[in-house]
Interface confidence: low
Amino acid sequence: QSSERRVVAHMPGDIIIGALFSVHHQPTVDKVHERKCGAVREQYGIQRVEAMLHTLERINSDPTLLPNITLGCEIRDSCWHSAVALEQSIEFIRDSLISSEEEEGLVRCVDGSSSSFRSKKPIVGVIGPGSSSVAIQVQNLLQLFNIPQIAYSATSMDLSDKTLFKYFMRVVPSDAQQARAMVDIVKRYNWTYVSAVHTEGNYGESGMEAFKDMSAKEGICIAHSYKIYSNAGEQSFDKLLKKLTSHLPKARVVACFCEGMTVRGLLMAMRRLGLAGEFLLLGSDGWADRYDVTDGYQREAVGGITIKLQSPDVKWFDDYYLKLRPETNHRNPWFQEFWQHRFQCRLEGFPQENSKYNKTCDSSLTLKTHHVQDSKMGFVINAIYSMAYGLHNMQMSLCPGYAGLCDAMKPIDGRKLLESLMKTNFTGVSGDMILFDENGDSPGRYEIMNFKEMGKDYFDYINVGSWDNGELKMDDDEVWSKKSNIIRSVCSEPCEKGQIKVIRKGEVSCCWTCTPCKENEYVFDEYTCKACQLGSWPTDDLTGCDLIPVQYLRWGDPEPDYKDDDDK
């Protein structure tokens, strides 16, 4: 899919909500200039498109929510890439501009007569995109036109700054919270010396910055910090892995504030370099419990501890999604491409030149096979409902006693909608309260996951703890079968009694050599020996000095036995 022709999913309505989903993977390095996106995605793409379409159906059939108003949508593909998402956002804006000029009677034909042509309805708000870096670029554009944006997975801390991103809101917490959760895990297992890796781009950079700041305050040292793009080549990942091995065996823990595909790149490099089992990866929610990150590289991922936004599966979505079939699902323009990709087959009637598969798709194929719901499904749905409730509250205040869109809501004023959205609170799809603080952020609740070998060649994620508004709970026995199995990630071992730490020049504070105090010295503090004053001697535990008792010789005491140097 290149920049020439972009596919769009439409659903008609009185009010149109825009959405940006990563229907395809981001362009590879060699295709970036032509904005040619990668393969179709199921969880992050097709499932989210279907969630939007079906959630709007549910909202439209709910008589208590926006009665007499139909919500429609326009879904575009962001390809998890800023340039593509911006191009698509400009399309949203263009529709809005033409529509508002039309409202004001500014659209006229070349001959001067007024136009009877009705362009598309304006987009009142945008759901998404998923990536923080992409969301920032999109927000920079949308806020110029007062179009509110509600994100379902863009968690960068930068987006909390309302002076810069006024029209941005999210149903997920800021990354400052998961950085704190990661530091709390590091502290729990007494890992004082860790390597750090992050994905280049806003999500990774700001998240890692927070992790490093918090680590420093807790006395945790970073052996070295590295950054890499998710779409970097094999050589780049191999080079990074070789650098990480240079800190072994001391820095065995690698804190990775990374997108899922960066983690996958690391796992693949571990496979190539034979480094499975050498590191313990501590991953942010970009990894969470995604199988597309670990598939084929499970041995390398074993032991990984990850942060996952708390979001249970949405049963009603599966009930809808698993029944979908390519011969009947025509409203999702990417569905046939996805079906062929998912089952590696060619659909009958699909142009041969567009398909790279020889085998024809069997009619018995079903999405139930190996189905995994998108881990952020609940957030996607909550973001859509937030927009609906915001519009509902706005309608209630602007059109009291009126069912439907009154004149006061035509056209919809983005400033008023933003105001209404910020005040919105409702029970989310998983039964939790959805509300926004003054920065448009939602509260932080995370699950701690552990990727384990459950049996021979069977691997899975298991929930081993939670982090809820500052409180970490971990089932240590589930993570480590024995206390002795807890991985050590320290630069230097504690010094023995009577020794002090000598920090090597240019080293971090966690790396030292242990040096014994001299015979007449005691340990003043962990870095200093002090000589006892004349007439005193170090105590047995070397923590202070005792006066040497003065012994006076009396007549009748045995004579002291002196030895000459010559005496052998």
Epitope: E234, L241, K242, T245, L248, R271, R272, L273, G274, L275, A276, G277, E278, G296, Y297, R299
Partner: antibody
Framework: QQQLEESGGGLVKPGGTLTLTCKVS?????????MCWVRQAPGKGLEWIAC???????TYYASWAKGRFTSSKTSSTTVTLQMTSLTAADTATYFC?????????????WGPGTLVTVSS | DIVMTQTPASVEAAVGGTVTIKCQAS??????LAWYQQKPGQPPKLLIY???NLESGVPSRFKGSGSGTEFTLTISDLECADAATYYC???????????FGGGTEVVVK
């Protein structure tokens, strides 16, 4: 049942070229495996030559094999090893083996081997 | 390239006895070591991978240990069927290359 089978061995003159083929049956070759080549001179020990990753076709060679030996994935079920500028020292039984890594997990499945004799 | 030195070249032991084979890598290879058993006219058979993991179907009499540069294969309760040549295979991550040890012939009396 999973099996590997080498073919293409035989007598070749010094300086000649030979291509060995490893045929995979009973396994999903397109998955995450490495197909590797190991040789064993008569009465001698094992010597690693190269590996190719089934996923992306990435190749890995012993330093002595670079330039003279080339491993390729020619179809969804076959891998080849092309050997050029052969000398008597290349006389050996050539094994094809499958592993989950270039070497980190060892090679769990081996073919019976094919004998290559370099002689004038 | 990595060099694997295997000792001894040959060892003899009685049925029911124990044999220890050592393998030394010229550079640290972490846990990237495998052990194989080879009988005349047959391809090698994987016994141990990643230094200490027993391949499925291999009796627990075979035990691998070590990491870094020093590795050991211990065969206890020797059986006649254990008579074979044993090879270690080291994998050096930095150069993505493998090397086999010279082999140890185990003779069971």
């Amino acid at each position: 049942q999973q099996q590997l089978e080498e073919s293409g061995g035989g007598l070749v003159k010094p300086g000649g070229t030979l291509t060995l083929t490893c045929k995979v049956s009973g396994i999903d070759f397109s998955s995450y495996y490495y197909m590797c080549w190991v040789r064993q001179a008569p009465g001698k020990g094992l010597e690693w030559i190269a590996c190719i990753y089934a996923g992306d076709g990435g190749t890995y060679y012993a330093s002595w094999a670079k330039g003279r030996f080339t491993s390729s994935k020619t179809s969804s079920t076959t891998v080849t090893l092309q050997m050029t500028s052969l000398t008597a020292a290349d006389t050996a039984t050539y094994f094809c083996a499958r592993g989950s890594g270039v070497g980190s997990y060892g090679y769990s499945l081996w073919g019976p081997g094919t004998l290559v004799t370099v002689s004038s | 390239d990595i060099v694997m030195t295997q000792t001894p070249a040959s060892v003899e032991a009685a049925v029911g006895g124990t044999v220890t084979i050592k393998c030394q890598a010229s550079e640290s290879i972490y846990s990237n070591l495998a052990w194989y058993q080879q009988k005349p006219g047959q391809p090698p058979k994987l016994l141990i991978y990643r230094a200490s993991n027993l391949e499925s179907g291999v009796p627990s009499r075979f035990k691998g240990s070590g990491s870094g540069t020093e590795f050991t294969l211990t065969i206890s309760d020797l059986e006649c069927a254990d008579a074979a040549t044993y090879y270690c295979q080291g994998y050096y991550a930095s150069t993505t290359t493998n090397a086999f040890g010279g082999g140890t012939e185990v003779v069971v009396k």
